[in-house]
């Protein structure tokens, strides 16, 4: 069975084809080759000499036991080599020779017992080394690591490392890898020698499910003293053994580290006193809790010095009391409990993401809700009922506003967005908004993107509601049940580049409403019920138009519409997916491609 | 279509068939077997995925006695610092994991419950596997 040609001459997918040897019938120019799940078993010298241009080579689960010297010789352009799941028993010293451009080496679950005799010291270009799920017992980074000056990611998770000694990291003292991210999760650690990490700088350190008791966790974290880390991730996994006990003593040792960003990811334990618990983390710039349960929600009003707070997928008794002077970014998403939003006091806040919480807002939105006048980004998408009772007074700095898939009330009772002259992006898609007031978008003089799909209009008619949106470049009006539009609805949108009118209910096509859209490049009218043109003679669309989508409509392919069908053929160079433009009537032409029709009409009057 | 038996409990019998062409082997054990009236136990899965599990989610299509429920999407792996350790599993890496579950207080009517589980992962998104579970429910007190 032949390989699948994904991109001609470039990418070939040969997965699970029962190959015992490397195929020789693929082009020399192949750059991406997936040979995974084939019983190759043995890689001899110059195994891939037929593919000198290879950049990505996937050999996952190929039952490879032996890799000889120079197996990859000639692959000087290879940047990614994947060896996951091969039971390697014999790895020659020169197994990886010739890989002068290799940036990513994945040797997950390959029976690797030690880094010491892993022959990769010459791979100077290596950026990512993943040796997770192996049998490595020692964390000693071999001397050859001093050659790997570009290394940015080292994944040692799911190995057998129990202890870390001062000598293990000596090579990092000689040659500090300032950008190194290190993942040691799922190693059964019980000892970190104090001073082992002294004066070590890491970009990121991840330690999840490493400790089988609170005491071990406590002493190991104390053993990290002196480490300077940009981002520290601690925590557990839901499907692994979890700590039976967790209290403030666990994290006391963090006072002896220099941490820029901290994240606690999953803890099967109720956090009650977060002030004491995170006492050593009051001055990190970014603080993040993922998948934890928080009992006392008042604690977030303590004077933490955080600039970014992230609470994701957590459980709360009620919406937390948030009073944080220095906070600039708050991400509070996919949380449970506390369904009603309560006011927060965050005077420095610029970015607020409150999406996917099922929250309801009794009154939205003004400065008093968020305790700030600096807000530039506000995401309230995928929530519950949001009642618009104020038009963003004090929030005039807003540039990005997202309400999609929340239930907006009172949207047509006043000019909700009147204050937002700096707003660039607005998404009110699928918000149950019924447009019954022409001033709905008044004030949005800087708006560039407006998404309002899945809403409705009074009498299914689009009126002149966009008159002030002179900078608009993207407008989505899909799924709005529209049947008619004002001929002047788009007259002020001279900058508009993309207009989506798909999935509405137009019976006819008219070019007239688009005559002023001098910048229009994409017009999507797919999934309507267009049968013919509104007027017998259709004018041209703006000359800027590059893509016109008329697929999945109800074209009436009869003589009386000959001029419209001819006009469609004349637009052929603009049309996308022409094979999905089919006749709906009459019954003998149903399903025929419109462009293949040859309608010759006898005008017998 | 070959049917794979999972387990029997006092009020349910659970089996599955593949609903994709590939039928890559997957081993599923539930201990103790699920009782629909109330259940607590461990789900053990052994599987070698044909693509990375990053951003794994399930589409669930549930049928209750021929009545179709709306499609549900259950996100398992968001993509970074996920709850489950198998979210970091790579294509070709052995996934051998035990997940605890519990639910209570749901009353099910007697009959045949079908659940099509479409597992989708990776970027670009592609189907990982598709299993159709059949649960025959015989409530012993209803």
């Amino acid at each position: 069975e032949p390989c699948v040609e994904v991109v001609p001459n470039i990418t070939y997918q040969c997965m699970e084809l029962n190959f015992y040897k490397i195929p020789d019938n693929l082009p020399f120019s192949t750059k991406n080759l997936d040979l995974s799940f084939n019983p190759l078993r043995h890689l001899g010298s110059y195994s891939f000499f037929s593919f000198p241009e290879l950049q990505v080579l996937d050999l996952s689960r190929c039952e490879i036991q032996t890799i000889e010297d120079g197996a990859y010789q000639s692959l000087s352009h290879l940047s990614t080599l994947i060896l996951t799941g091969n039971p390697i028993q014999s790895l020659a010293l020169g197994a990886f020779s010739g890989l002068s451009s290799l940036q990513k080496l994945v040797a997950v679950e390959t029976n690797l017992a030690s880094l010491e005799n892993f022959p990769i010291g010459h791979l100077k270009t290596l950026k990512e080394l993943n040796v997770a799920h192996n049998l490595i017992q020692s964390f000693k980074l071999p001397e050859y690591f001093s050659n790997l000056t570009n290394l940015e990611h080292l994944d040692l998770s799911s190995n057998k490392i129990q202890s870390i000694y001062c000598t293990d990291l000596r090579v990092l003292h000689q040659m500090p890898l300032l950008n190194l991210s290190l993942d040691l999760s799922l190693n059964p650690m019980n000892f970190i020698q104090p001073g082992a990490f002294k004066e070590i700088r890491l970009h990121k350190l991840t330690l999840r499910n490493n400790f089988d008791s609170l005491n071990v966790m406590k002493t190991c974290i104390q053993g990290l003293a002196g480490l300077e880390v940009h981002r520290l991730v601690l925590g557990e996994f839901r499907n692994e053994g979890n700590l039976e006990k967790f209290d403030k003593s666990a994290l006391e040792g963090l006072c002896n580290l220099t941490i820029e960003e901290f994240r606690l990811a999953y803890l099967d334990y109720y956090l009650d006193d977060i002030i004491d618990l995170f006492n050593c983390l009051t001055n990190v710039s970014s603080f993040s809790l993922v998948s934890v349960t928080i009992e006392r929600v008042k604690d977030f009003s303590y004077n933490f010095g955080w600039q970014h707070l992230e609470l994701v997928n957590c459980k709360f008794g009620q919406f937390p009391t948030l009073k944080l002077k220095s906070l600039k970014r708050l991400t509070f998403t996919s949380n449970k409990g506390g369904n009603a939003f309560s006011e927060v006091d965050l005077p420095s806040l610029e970015f607020l993401d409150l999406s996917r919480n099922g929250l309801s807002f009794k009154g939205c939105c003004s400065q008093s809700d968020f305790g700030t006048t600096s807000l530039k980004y506000l995401d309230l998408s995928f929530n519950g009922v949001i009642t618009m009772s104020s038009n963003f007074l004090g929030l005039e700095q807003l540039e990005h506003l997202d309400f999609q898939h929340s239930n907006l009330k009172q949207m047509s009772e006043f000019s909700v967005f009147l204050s937002l002259r700096n707003l660039i992006y607005l998404d009110i898609s699928h918000t149950h908004t019924r447009v019954a007031f022409n001033g709905i978008f008044n004030g949005l003089s800087s708006l560039e993107v407006l998404k309002m799909a899945g809403n409705s209009f009074q009498e299914n008619f689009l009126p002149d509601i966009f008159t002030e949106l002179r900078n608009l470049t993207f407008l989505d009006l899909s799924q709005c049940q529209l049947e008619q539009l004002s001929p002047t609805a788009f007259n002020s949108l001279s900058s508009l580049q993309v207009l989506n009118m798909s999935h509405n209910n137009f019976f006819s096509l008219d070019t007239f409403p688009y005559k002023c859209l001098n910048s229009l490049q994409v017009l999507d009218y797919s999934l309507n019920h267009i049968m013919t043109s509104k007027k017998q003679e259709l004018q041209h669309f703006p000359s800027s138009l590059a893509f016109l989508n008329l697929t999945q409509n109800d074209f009436a392919c009869t003589c009386e519409h000959q001029s419209f069908l001819q006009w469609i053929k004349d637009q052929r160079q603009l049309l996308v997916e022409v094979e999905r433009m089919e006749c709906a009537t009459p019954s003998d032409k149903q399903g025929m491609p419109v462009l293949s029709l040859n309608i010759t009409c006898q005008m017998n009057k | 279509q070959k049917q794979y038996w999972v387990c029997n409990s006092s009020d349910a019998s659970i089996s599955y068939t593949y609903c994709d062409k590939m039928q890559y082997p997957i081993s599923i054990n539930v201990n103790p077997c699920i009782e629909l009236k109330r259940s607590k136990g461990l789900l053990h899965i052994f599987y070698i995925p044909r693509r990375d599990l990053k951003q794994l989610y399930f589409n669930l299509y549930i049928t209750v006695n021929t009545m179709n429920l709306p499609k549900r999407k259950e996100v398992i792996c968001r993509g970074s610092d996920d709850d489950y350790s198998f979210c970091r599993a790579l294509k070709g890496e052995t996934v051998n994991t035990t997940i605890s579950f519990s639910f209570k207080g749901i009353k099910f009517s007697k009959g045949k419950y079908k659940c099509v589980v479409e597992a989708i992962s990776g970027s670009p998104e592609e189907m990982l596997f598709c299993l159709e579970f059949v649960i025959l429910h015989q409530p012993n007190s209803n």
């Epitope: 049947e483 209910n505 019920h529 | -």
Partner: nanobody, 119 residues
């Protein structure tokens, strides 16, 4: 399941009028397009008229423009076709059609009602 039942057909002299009715049952169709097709002996079935949910948009085939009027009463789940100035070439079986609530065109069909125009 949606059922469409037409009525009002019959024999009429050229120049006369008829009013066809179509009642939908099984679910409300107030949010979908409805219309009328016809099929004359030996000819293909083709659309005559169509009306949008709010009645804002209507479509008529060229041959009936100015003579036929489509209308609907959403409260009664009914669509009508008023046919004036009938001609012998209007003789056909007239079918009521409705789109699906999901937006698929011409999803539901009635059994048809015979209209015969004699000269």
């Amino acid at each position: 399941e949606v059922q469409l039942v037409e009525s009002g057909g019959g024999l009429v002299q050229a120049g006369g009028s008829l009013r066809l009715s179509c009642v939908a049952s099984g679910r409300t169709l107030s949010t979908v397009n409805m219309g009328w097709f016809r099929q004359a002996p030996g000819k293909e079935r083709d659309i005559v008229a169509r009306i949008s949910p709010s009645s804002v948009s209507t479509y008529y085939s060229e041959s009936v423009k100015g003579r036929f009027t489509i209308s609907r009463d959403n409260a009664k789940n009914t669509v009508y076709l008023q046919m004036n100035s009938l001609r012998p070439e209007d003789t056909a079986v007239y079918y009521c059609v409705a789109d699906s609530p999901g937006g698929r065109s011409y999803e539901y069909w009635g059994q048809g009602t015979q209209v015969t125009v004699s000269s």
